[in-house]
Interface confidence: low
């Protein structure tokens, strides 16, 4: 008779990424007998929750339960019922909630209270909802991509082809861009990390890593746009803002009260003689780039070298995975190919931003106008942040790999977060050789 595989002995885990603009639920799966091996956990499902980020629910906390229902029900379907009770669920909220907490601890806690109550109603092993720090967000993103790339393993990987493979075990740096913050994390080469706040020490699979990380709150793409608008409206002579970061012919009315709602624009706040202003796009990449650069204070640095705003940044080292909005925006602009040079990216951005709004709307009829209108800004912002903010150059640009998924798992902090909380990253190399993927009798 033919050999039959024994029933799969697998485990599941759920992580909700409560970002500033939306919430996503990720389901992970791994062979139970290989928990401590590197690279065996993989994503089986991503469910994007319909609606905004949880920080937008301050005025309607009672709607949070319904908001989370569809994705939690999806998790119920995907994970076998027999596994429900032992499947951990974690919710990590990022910069959107950090900003809300800056405005009001009470409001942030109220939102988290309701989130916790809602998630506790499901048959899973709910482990809590919390606002993760920027340092954690950076660190877990770095762990995720290096785990998926097999960088922590001294053994042959169980999967066949690793994308972006280099011949050595040097880890990749991680570049993460969200709506409200951006993180840069990497192992510097023989460089003292001059600022203790930016230093992390890990021992993973028997090897020590001295990691640099920083999270720039308010420098995610959405908050950076609010900052830029708040800065530019200061010098507008009337309620018309001619903006080079939007396509020619684009028009949008912005409420001043919305502009000053976020703590990110506080430094630009002033009494304006109008309640609303109108953005009128003029679509000029170079001027947009110049306007964005004014958000980065590079005149002050208390260390040997800085990124911006006086934040220490060691010399860049090795290859980097750029994910989340770095990837989504560049993918939309068709600029993720390894073959596209930085000069080519700049050239393409100049052309894209100069295209009339009516033409853009026709070319991308299926894309929501709110998102479509902001790709010129977002693409320009990514270039400005990487080149002037983090000091990548035209030649080090080729070391940036825009990554959406690695081996079917999304690049981002959630997998690293779960691996850590479920103790699946051992400090030392596991002694025994793990069993093969499935055992036959």
């Amino acid at each position: 008779t033919q050999n039959k595989a024994l029933p799969e002995n697998v485990k599941y885990g759920i992580v909700l990424d409560a970002g500033s603009s939306h919430t996503s639920l990720y389901i992970y799966k791994w062979p139970a007998e290989k928990e401590n091996d590197t690279g065996v956990v993989h994503q089986v499902e991503e469910c994007r929750v319909a609606g905004p980020g949880i920080s937008k629910f301050v005025q309607k906390v009672n709607a949070i339960g319904i908001y989370l229902t569809a994705c939690m029900e999806r998790a119920r379907e995907v994970i076998p019922r027999s596994q429900h009770q032992e499947t951990p669920v974690y919710l990590g909220a990022t910069a959107g909630m950090r900003l809300l907490r800056m405005e009001s601890e009470e409001l942030a806690d109220r939102v988290l209270d309701v989130v916790e109550r809602s998630l506790s109603n499901y048959p899973f092993d709910f482990q809590g909802a919390r606002i993760i720090t920027g340092q954690e967000e950076g660190a877990y993103g770095w762990i995720t991509i290096n785990y998926l790339l097999g960088k922590f393993s001294q053994k042959t990987r169980w999967f066949s082809i690793v994308p972006y493979e280099t011949n050595n075990q040097e880890t990749f740096g991680a570049l993460d861009l969200g709506g409200a913050s951006t993180q840069v994390t990497f192992v510097p080469q023989n460089q003292t990390i001059e600022s203790p706040d930016n230093a992390l020490q890990f021992r993973l699979y028997g090897k020590d890593y001295n990691v640099y990380t920083h999270s720039f709150l308010c420098y995610g793409k959405d908050q950076a746009l609010w900052q830029k608008l708040a800065k530019d409206i200061q010098v507008a002579s009337n309620e018309i803002l001619r903006d080079p970061c939007f396509h020619p012919g684009y028009k949008k009315v912005v409420n001043v009260s919305d502009l000053y709602k976020t703590p990110c624009t506080k430094r630009f706040e002033m009494t304006l003689p109008f309640q609303q202003f109108e953005i009128q796009g003029i679509g000029n990449y170079q001027q947009c780039h110049q306007s964005i650069l004014e958000l980065f204070n590079t005149s002050y640095c208390p260390y040997s070298q800085c990124a911006f705003n006086g934040i220490f940044l060691p010399p860049l080292q090795g290859d980097f995975g750029a994910f989340s909005a770095f990837y989504f925006v560049m993918k939309f602009l068709n600029l993720t190919s390894e073959k596209v040079s930085q000069e080519k990216v700049t050239e393409m951005m100049k052309k894209f931003c100069a295209q009339p709004w009516e033409e853009i709307k026709t070319s991308y009829a299926g894309v929501k106008e709110k998102y479509l209108s902001e790709y010129c800004f977002s693409g320009t912002y990514i270039l400005s942040l990487l080149l002037q903010g983090y000091h990548f150059t035209a030649d080090s640009w080729e070391h940036i790999h825009f990554i959406g998924k690695i081996q079917g798992s999304d690049a981002g902090w959630t997998l690293g977060y779960m691996l850590n909380l479920t103790n699946m990253i051992p400090a030392e190399q596991p002694l025994s050789t793990p069993l093969s993927h499935s055992t036959y009798v």
């Epitope: 301050v58 601890e105 009470e106 806690d109 109220r110 209270d113 706040d197």
Partner: antibody
């Protein structure tokens, strides 16, 4: 279980300074701001300010600016408050209390007595 | 600063009866549809204990006989039925804006 353990009573002379501590356990220290409250007989409870353990950022009641300095040591999960240029007006019980919705967790208080 | 005026300054209530303490704010403590008003109980030699948050939500482990109500500028704490263990000082507090402020307190005793 959330616990905030405060340092013992202090008897200090006018003009001197005092530093008290508040050691946290039972929760992730950096997830919550630490607030300080003064309790004296004449004026009831007064909020002094808070510190964000993530970055050491502080927010003070204007009344206590220059009087109180808040600091933290994240590795030992301890918050500190230093009071300077003490006068008899500063004789009181000082509480640390964890931030977030509702000050549900309080230290037992540190009694400061200013006397020549 | 938001000033909280608490009344009465002291109150004596018979066991089993209702005690009502009021707190008036000099300006609204509502934000995003939530009232940032809190009620604390404090006994001699002990730290304050949270009874009510967000004007009407009971704190963890607080007996059902404690209830809070109100919005905007006018709030009240009700204790019914009064028990011997409820003898204490009661404070209202707002955390809508910095500086957070407390009421001057109400001393509750048994008649």
């Amino acid at each position: 279980e959330v616990q905030l353990q405060q340092s013992g009573p202090e008897l200090v002379k006018p003009g001197a300074s005092v530093r008290m501590s508040c050691k946290a356990s039972g929760y992730t220290f950096t997830d919550y701001n630490m607030h300080w409250v003064k309790k004296n007989h004449g004026k009831g409870l007064e909020w002094i300010g808070y510190i964000n353990p993530n970055n050491g950022g502080t927010t003070y009641n204007q009344k206590f600016k220059g009087k109180a300095t808040l600091t933290v040591n994240t590795s030992s999960k301890t918050a500190y408050m230093e009071l300077r240029s003490l006068t008899s007006e500063d004789s009181a019980v000082y509480y640390c209390t964890r931030g977030g919705t509702r000050f549900a967790s309080w230290g037992q208080g540190t009694l400061v007595t200013v006397s020549a | 600063n938001i000033v909280l005026t608490q009344s009465p300054a002291s109150l004596a209530v018979s066991l089993g009866q209702r005690a009502t303490i009021s707190c008036r704010a000099s300006e609204s403590v509502d934000n995003y549809g939530i009232s940032f008003m809190y009620w604390f109980q404090q006994k001699p030699g002990q730290p304050p204990k949270l009874l009510i948050y967000a004007a009407s939500t009971q704190g963890s482990g607080v007996p059902a006989r404690f209830s809070g109500s109100g919005s905007g500028t006018d709030f009240s704490l009700n204790i019914h039925p009064m028990e011997e263990d409820d003898t204490a000082m009661y404070f209202c507090q707002q955390s809508k804006e910095v500086p957070f402020t407390f009421g001057s307190g109400t001393k509750l005793e048994i008649k």
